[in-house]
Interface confidence: low
C-alpha cells in the first residue's frame, strides 16, 4: 500500500511539475520590437512610431498583443520596459533642416478602460550636427520596471522621425514580464 | 495509516520544494563582465574586444562559460543583454588623431553550428572632442531581451578602442536568463 | 482508501501551490523610484541625491526599503539595478556658470555591516552647452546585474543638479531581484 | 488581407455569425474591430478584441453582439438577436488605436427581415 | 463621441476643404481619418491627428491635438470626392460610437 501511494505521488508530482512549469511559460509575457524601416514618417516633429516587426529577425512576441504601432498588454504584471532608438544622417542624404536638433525618445502607456496617456521613460539629447562633418550618429536607451494592466498600450514617440535608423540591432523597443502583482 | 500518509507526504513534498528551488537556481544562468584594461586594444577602428573579468570585484558568472573575449550560452532560453561602455579622453594622454570620432558599440552573436555572426544591438554616438576642453567623456548603454541557444556566443565590438574607460563600474556587459524558450 | 489518499493530496497540492505562489510573490523584492524635484540640491559639484518619491506616480517598493535617500536591500540576491538620470537648461533659467559641463552618474553600494561605498555603475558624458541654442537637454541610462546582501544601500549621485531634469518620467532608478544566491 | 463572410437574409431573432478571416498577419499579434454600416448611413464601431484580452464593445453593442477568436486566423461577431435595424453591411478592420484601422474587409451584407 | 462638420460640403476642384471633429473629451493626437467611397470600404487616410498613410497624396492634411481636429484637403481632385469619416482611438470604455457622424465632399 505505502508503496503504491509513493508511485501514485511520484507519478502526480511529477504531472504537477509539468503543469507548473507549462503555466510558468504561458505565465511570461515578452516582447522585442524592431523598427519597420518602410513606413517610418518623414518630418522633424515629435511623432508616435506605428510601424514594428514582430516576428522577424530580432523581433519576437509572447502573450502580448501589437497593433497599431502599439504594444497591448494581455496580462497584469510588473514589467521590465525598454527601448533602444538610434538615429543617423549622412551628408549624401543631404542637408539637415537645422543644425540643432533635439533628438528624443518617448515610452508612453495608454489606458483604453480609463482614457488616459502618460510618458513612463524619457530620453535624449540636443545636438549640433555641424556640416563640417560628413557622417553624424546618436542613440538613446532607456529602461525601467513598471506595473502593467491588462489593457494597456505601450507605444514609442520620437522626434526627429526621419533621422531614425532603420537596422534591427538600433531601433527597437521591448518588454518582459518579471512578476505577478500581489 | 493516514498519519503516516501525511507525515510522509509532508517529507516527501519537502524535499521536491528544496529540489525544485536548487533546479530552478541551476537553472537560471547569468555573467556580468568587467574590461580588463591590462589587454584593450589600441587604434581607432573597430575592434571585438576579447578581455573581460569574470571572476573579481562586479564580475561574476554562472552557467554561462567565457572564453576566447566571447560568453558562451550553455543553456537554451531567453536572455536579457547589456553593456555599458563608457569613453574618455584627458590631454594629458596627448592629443587625438582626429577631434571627430565616432565612439559605438556592438553586441554580437555567434553561432558556431551554422558559422554567422550578426549584431544584436549597437548604440554611440558621433562626438566632437575638442582641444578646448582638457577632458572629454561618454558612455553608451544598450539592452534588450533575446532568445539564445546553447553554444552560440556573445562578444562586443567597440570603436576606438584606445579611449576606453578601463573601470569595472564604466565598461562592461552582461546577461541573464528571463525564461526558458517554449 | 486511495480515493481518500487522491482527494487529500489534491487538496494538500493546492495549498502548497498556493504557498509557493505567495512565497513567489514575497521573495521578489524591487523598486522604482522617481526624483523629488522639491529637493534638488543646487550648483554644479557632484553630489549624491537624497529626496525620491516611492509612493506616487510611477514610483513603487516592495520588499526594500527607502531610507534617507538610499534603497536598502531587504533580501540576499542577484538584481538588475538601473538608472536613468535627465539634465536639461533653458537660457530663460539664466546662464550657465561654464558652457562646458560634465554630466555624470554614479550608482554606488554601500555596505554597512564592512563600512565602505563603491560604485557599481557609471555614465555620462561631457558637453558643451553653448549659448547658441536656447535649449539643452542630455540623458544617460546605465544598467547592470548585482550580487546584493540583505543592509547594503543603493545611492545615485550626479554632477550638477541643478540641471536636473524634475519630471517622474526623466530622472528615476531603480531595481528588481532576478534570482537567489546559491 | 482581411475578408468577412456569414451575411444572408435572416429572420428577426435568428442568430446569425459573421467571420472575419485574415492573412498576411497573426491575430495572435494584432487587434481586429467590427464596424457596421446602415444603408445610406455613416460607420458604427461595434466592438474589437484581441489575442489573450476580452472583447470590448460599444455601449449601444454590448448584449446584442459578441465578438469572440474562433482560430488563428478568424474572428467571429455573433448578432445574437438580430432586429431589422442591424441590416447593414458588416466590416471587418486591423486596430483601433492612434493608428487607426488600417486595412479593411470589403465587408458582407446582413439584411434582417420578417 | 465624436460630432463631425460639416454633414456636407461643395467644392470646386482646386479647391481647398476643410472638415473638423471635435471629441467629447480629450483623446490627446488618438484620432484617424478615413475616406469612403460608394460601394467600397472605408481607406485609412490620417492616423495618430496627423500622420498620413502610406501612399496618401500630401494635399491631405489632419491637424490638432485634445478635443479638436482638423482634416484639411488643399488643390481638391475630382477623385477626391466621397464620404470622410474621423474616428477616436482612444477610449473603448463608455463610448456610443468612435466614428464622427461623416462629411459628403462633392467635388464641382
Known amino acids: 500500500g505505502s508503496q503504491h501511494i509513493r508511485a501514485e505521488k511520484a507519478m502526480v508530482d511529477g504531472s504537477w511539475l509539468d503543469l507548473a512549469k507549462r503555466s510558468k511559460l504561458e505565465a511570461q509575457p515578452f516582447a522585442h520590437l524592431t523598427i519597420n524601416a518602410t513606413d517610418i514618417p518623414s518630418g522633424s516633429h515629435k511623432v508616435s512610431l506605428s510601424s514594428w516587426y514582430h516576428d522577424r529577425g530580432w523581433a519576437k512576441i509572447s502573450n502580448m498583443t501589437f497593433s497599431n504601432g502599439k504594444l497591448i498588454v494581455n496580462q497584469d504584471g510588473f514589467y521590465y520596459l525598454y527601448a533602444n532608438i538610434c538615429f543617423r544622417h549622412h551628408e549624401t542624404s543631404g542637408d539637415l533642416a537645422t543644425e540643432y536638433l533635439q533628438l528624443m525618445v518617448y515610452v508612453t502607456k495608454t489606458s483604453i478602460k480609463i482614457p488616459s496617456s502618460h510618458t513612463l521613460m524619457k530620453g535624449g539629447s540636443t545636438k549640433y550636427w555641424s556640416g563640417n562633418s560628413e557622417f553624424h550618429f546618436y542613440s538613446i536607451n532607456v529602461g525601467g520596471f513598471f506595473k502593467l494592466r491588462s489593457g494597456e498600450e505601450i507605444s514609442i514617440e520620437v522626434s526627429n522621425p526621419s533621422l531614425l535608423d532603420p537596422d534591427q540591432d538600433a531601433t527597437y523597443f521591448g518588454a518582459f514580464k518579471v512578476r505577478d502583482i500581489d | 495509516g493516514s498519519q503516516h500518509i501525511r507525515a510522509e507526504k509532508a517529507m516527501v513534498d519537502g524535499s521536491w520544494l528544496d529540489l525544485a528551488k536548487r533546479s530552478k537556481l541551476e537553472a537560471q544562468p547569468f555573467a556580468h563582465l568587467t574590461i580588463n584594461a591590462t589587454d584593450i586594444p589600441s587604434g581607432s577602428h573597430k575592434v571585438s574586444l576579447s578581455s573581460w573579468y569574470h571572476d573579481r570585484g562586479w564580475a561574476k558568472i554562472s552557467n554561462m562559460t567565457f572564453s576566447n573575449g566571447k560568453l558562451i550560452v550553455n543553456q537554451d532560453g531567453f536572455y536579457y543583454l547589456y553593456a555599458n561602455i563608457c569613453f574618455r579622453h584627458h590631454e594629458t594622454s596627448g592629443d587625438l588623431a582626429t577631434e571627430y570620432l565616432q565612439l559605438m558599440v556592438y553586441v554580437t552573436k555567434t553561432s558556431i553550428k551554422i558559422p554567422s555572426s550578426h549584431t544584436l544591438m549597437k548604440g554611440g554616438s558621433t562626438k566632437y572632442w575638442s582641444g578646448n576642453s582638457e577632458f572629454h567623456f561618454y558612455s553608451i548603454n544598450v539592452g534588450g531581451f533575446f532568445k539564445l541557444r546553447s553554444g552560440e556566443e556573445i562578444s562586443i565590438e567597440v570603436s576606438n578602442p584606445s579611449l576606453l574607460d578601463p573601470d569595472q563600474d564604466a565598461t562592461y556587459f552582461g546577461a541573464f536568463k528571463v525564461r526558458d524558450i517554449d | 482508501g486511495s480515493q481518500h489518499i487522491r482527494a487529500e493530496k489534491a487538496m494538500v497540492d493546492g495549498s502548497w501551490l498556493d504557498l509557493a505562489k505567495r512565497s513567489k510573490l514575497e521573495a521578489q523584492p524591487f523598486a522604482h523610484l522617481t526624483i523629488n524635484a522639491t529637493d534638488i540640491p543646487s550648483g554644479s559639484h557632484k553630489v549624491s541625491l537624497s529626496s525620491w518619491y516611492h509612493d506616487r506616480g510611477w514610483a513603487k517598493i516592495s520588499n526594500m526599503t527607502f531610507s534617507n535617500g538610499k534603497l536598502i536591500v531587504n533580501q540576499d540576491g542577484f538584481y538588475y539595478l538601473y538608472a536613468n538620470i535627465c539634465f536639461r537648461h533653458h537660457e530663460t533659467s539664466g546662464d550657465l556658470a561654464t558652457e562646458y559641463l560634465q554630466l555624470m552618474v554614479y550608482v554606488t553600494k554601500t555596505s554597512i555591516k564592512i563600512p565602505s561605498s563603491h560604485t557599481l555603475m557609471k555614465g555620462g558624458s561631457t558637453k558643451y552647452w553653448s549659448g547658441n541654442s536656447e535649449f539643452h537637454f542630455y540623458s544617460i541610462n546605465v544598467g547592470g546585474f548585482f550580487k546584493l546582501r540583505s543592509g547594503e544601500e543603493i545611492s545615485i549621485e550626479v554632477s550638477n543638479p541643478s540641471l536636473l531634469d524634475p519630471d517622474q518620467d526623466a530622472t528615476y532608478f531603480g531595481a528588481f531581484k532576478v534570482r537567489d544566491i546559491d | 488581407s482581411v475578408e468577412e463572410s456569414g451575411g444572408r437574409l435572416v429572420t428577426p431573432g435568428t442568430p446569425l455569425t459573421l467571420t472575419c478571416t485574415v492573412s498576411?498577419?497573426?491575430?495572435?499579434?494584432?487587434?481586429m474591430s467590427w464596424v457596421r454600416q446602415a444603408p445610406g448611413k455613416g460607420l458604427e464601431w461595434i466592438g474589437y478584441?484581441?489575442?489573450?484580452?476580452?472583447p470590448y464593445y460599444a455601449n449601444w453593442a454590448k448584449g446584442r453582439f459578441t465578438i469572440s477568436k474562433s482560430s488563428s486566423t478568424t474572428v467571429d461577431l455573433k448578432i445574437t438577436s438580430p432586429t431589422t435595424e442591424d441590416t447593414a453591411a458588416y466590416f471587418c478592420?486591423?486596430?483601433?488605436?492612434?493608428?487607426?484601422?488600417?486595412?479593411w474587409g470589403p465587408g458582407t451584407l446582413v439584411t434582417v427581415s420578417l | 463621441d465624436m460630432t463631425q462638420t460639416p454633414a456636407s460640403v461643395e467644392v470646386a476642384v482646386g479647391g481647398t476643404v476643410t472638415i473638423k471633429c471635435q471629441a467629447s473629451q480629450s483623446i490627446g493626437s488618438n484620432l484617424a481619418w478615413y475616406q469612403q467611397k460608394p460601394g467600397q470600404s472605408p481607406k485609412l487616410l490620417i492616423y495618430s491627428a496627423s500622420i498620413l498613410a502610406s501612399g496618401v497624396p500630401s494635399r491631405f492634411k489632419g491637424s490638432g491635438s485634445g478635443t479638436q481636429f482638423t482634416l484639411t484637403i488643399s488643390g481638391v481632385q475630382c477623385d477626391d470626392a466621397a464620404t470622410y469619416y474621423c474616428q477616436q482611438g482612444y477610449s473603448v470604455g463608455n463610448i456610443d460610437n468612435a466614428f464622427g457622424g461623416g462629411t459628403e465632399v462633392v467635388v464641382k
Open positions: 498576411g498577419f497573426s491575430l495572435s499579434n494584432d487587434v
Open positions: 478584441i484581441w489575442s489573450g484580452g476580452s
Open positions: 478592420a486591423r486596430g483601433f488605436g492612434s493608428s487607426g484601422l488600417n486595412i
